[in-house]
């Protein structure tokens, strides 16, 4: 296999040499078969190669590793453990690699791993200890700062009996390992709800992306602990209204920007507090674009243009007056 070039261009390994190389100890900084390597950029790209496992002979210098568009299926414990360890690996992208199982300790022995992208993998089985590495009640802190888990929901027929939200949250909270996490992306996962304890245990979060899910309500979610949250993406959900408690919490976060586009806002009497808040707040990005979806008579009305007289609820008739 050809040695890595020290120029910024990528050197490729000849695939037909792979079997010969794997029969002997790997050379210190060789480039794995089917990959492209740049020592100058500290980057290895093994992209769209239908790899079924993580190459064993990754160069020790690798800082950015792209393993996207493969067919990895399972990420076992210690999938990146090497001797000597991949001490420089800071960014790992495994998106779109047909992973359906990530086992406990899959990312162990990566002391510098700051950024992990598992997006676009149908993760039917994400171990609770995938990120913490152990089942201790308090694990060693993970170095992860950015965790990208967009569109990791498997097809419905491949989901296990437990709730998908619960499986993901268990992995996020195990051993309190992700206390230093600053960016968490969970877009496009069909989340119906956000378990109430998840945010309280991720105090360092600066960016939280929950866009394109199916969240109907935030009533039981508390953002109070996310003291330095900067962006909260809630676009393209099923939110009907934000209640006073949520509004007050968001207003109390001094660095936040909230993104609320494309939700089916219900413009009835329960919307009055939110409309008042929207008129006063600066934290909502593009607030002038928010429109009513229901009731029918209010459809496409701009929330900021509503007043209290517009926001009524149909009186509930006592049972004796209800018609069958």
């Amino acid at each position: 296999s050809s040695p890595t070039s020290s120029a910024s261009s990528f050197s490729s390994s000849a695939p037909f040499l792979a079997s010969a190389v794997s029969a002997q100890p790997p050379l210190p900084d060789q480039c794995p078969a089917l990959c492209e390597c740049s020592e100058a950029a500290r980057t290895v790209k093994c992209v769209n190669r239908n790899l079924t496992e993580v190459p064993t002979d990754l160069p020790a210098y690798v800082r950015n590793l792209f393993l996207t568009g493969n067919q990895l299926a399972v990420l076992p414990a210690g999938a990146f453990a090497r001797r000597p360890p991949l001490a420089e690996l800071a960014a790992l992208n495994l998106s779109g690699s047909r992973l359906d199982e990530v086992r406990a300790g899959a990312f162990e022995h990566l002391p510098s791993l700051r950024q992990l992208d598992l997006s676009h993998n149908p993760l039917a089985d994400l171990s609770p200890f995938a990120f913490s590495g152990s089942n201790a009640s308090v694990s060693a802190p993970s170095p992860l700062v950015e965790l990208i888990l967009n569109h990791i929901v498997p097809p419905e027929d491949e989901r296990q009996n437990r709730s998908f939200e619960g499986m993901v949250v268990a992995a996020l909270l195990a051993g309190r390992a992700l206390q230093g996490l600053r960016r968490l992306e969970l877009a496009s996962n069909h989340f119906l709800y956000l378990p109430r304890d998840v945010l309280a245990q991720l105090p360092s979060l600066r960016h939280l992306d929950l866009s394109n899910n199916s969240l109907v309500s935030l009533t039981y979610v508390s953002f109070r602990n996310l003291t330095h949250l900067e962006s909260l993406h809630l676009e393209d959900n099923a939110l009907k209204v934000l209640h006073n408690g949520t509004l007050a919490e968001l207003q109390g976060l001094p660095h936040i920007r909230v993104f609320l586009d494309n939700n089916p806002w219900v413009c009835d009497c329960h919307m009055a507090d939110m409309v008042t808040w929207l008129k006063e707040t600066e934290v909502v990005q593009g607030k002038d674009r928010l429109t009513c979806a229901y009731p029918e008579k209010m459809r496409n009305r701009v929330l900021l243009e509503l007043n209290s007289a517009d926001l009524d609820c149909d009186p509930i008739l006592p049972p004796s007056l209800q018609t069958s």
């Epitope: 960014a91 700051r114 950024q115 700062v145 950015e146 600053r182 960016r183 600066r206 960016h207 003291t227 330095h228 900067e230 962006s231 109390g252 001094p254 660095h255 920007r257 600066e282 990005q285 593009g286």
Partner: antibody, heavy 115, light 107 residues
């Protein structure tokens, strides 16, 4: 770690306008907020304003509103602070600082206003 | 605007000493209180945010406490490299405001 590199020192006449730049590089996890802070010679720190780089939303200290304009170019990860109608009391070092809690600071740009 | 009053304005201490600086806000700022270090000709550094959270890479001899309007910054054992000016700053209510600074010198 985030590196913030600011443009060089400027000498301006009263009434003129100065535009300082601040380029962010290095760490991938920099904040969306970029703040600007003034430090007059021998004095303390004074917050001018900030910009949320992704959508251009700004907040200003009322003392500078109308004279300070903060902008950002996301394609080059560069923020700018323009100060108009300069007067002698604007002579100071101006810092950019990245983060809600101003986690990382630039080296400062000295602006001297003198006729 | 919220006024931040820092004391003392200057302070002389010996290597190994425990040093404390106070900061008082003119109104409640919850825990949104940060501490910065400025050395001549160097970039300003964030040491502590949200009253007591240590910024990454900051030595554990630095700590902070308080809540509401009264806050304290402590260096448990002064080191020669700690000679600098220290500022408190509130980021609870716009506009953000700084204390006047405390210049720390070695005896």
């Amino acid at each position: 770690e985030v590196q913030l590199v600011q443009s060089g020192a400027e000498v301006k006449k009263p009434g003129a306008t100065v535009k300082i730049s601040c380029k962010a590089s290095g760490y991938a996890f920099s904040s969306s907020w970029m703040n600007w802070v003034k430090q007059a010679p021998g004095k303390g720190l004074e917050w001018i304003g900030r910009i949320y780089r992704e959508d251009g939303h700004t907040n200003y200290n009322g003392k500078f509103k109308g004279r300070a304009t903060i902008t950002a170019d996301t394609s080059t990860t560069t923020a700018y602070m323009e100060l108009s109608s300069l007067r002698s009391e604007d002579s100071a070092v101006y810092f950019c600082a990245n983060g809600g809690a101003m986690d990382y600071w630039g080296q400062g740009t000295l602006v001297t206003v003198s006729s | 605007d919220i006024q931040m009053t820092q004391s003392p304005s200057s302070l002389s201490a010996s290597v190994g000493d425990r040093v404390t600086i106070s900061c008082r806000a003119s109104q409640d700022i919850s825990n949104y209180l940060n501490w910065y270090q400025q050395k001549p000709g160097k970039a300003v550094k964030l040491l502590i945010y949200y009253t007591s959270r240590l910024h990454s890479g900051v030595p554990s001899r630095f700590s902070g406490s308080g809540s509401g309007t009264d806050f304290t910054f402590t260096i448990s054992s002064l080191q020669p490299e700690d000679i600098a000016t220290y500022f408190c700053q509130q980021d609870n209510t716009l506009p953000w405001t700084f204390g006047g600074g405390t210049k720390l010198e070695i005896k």
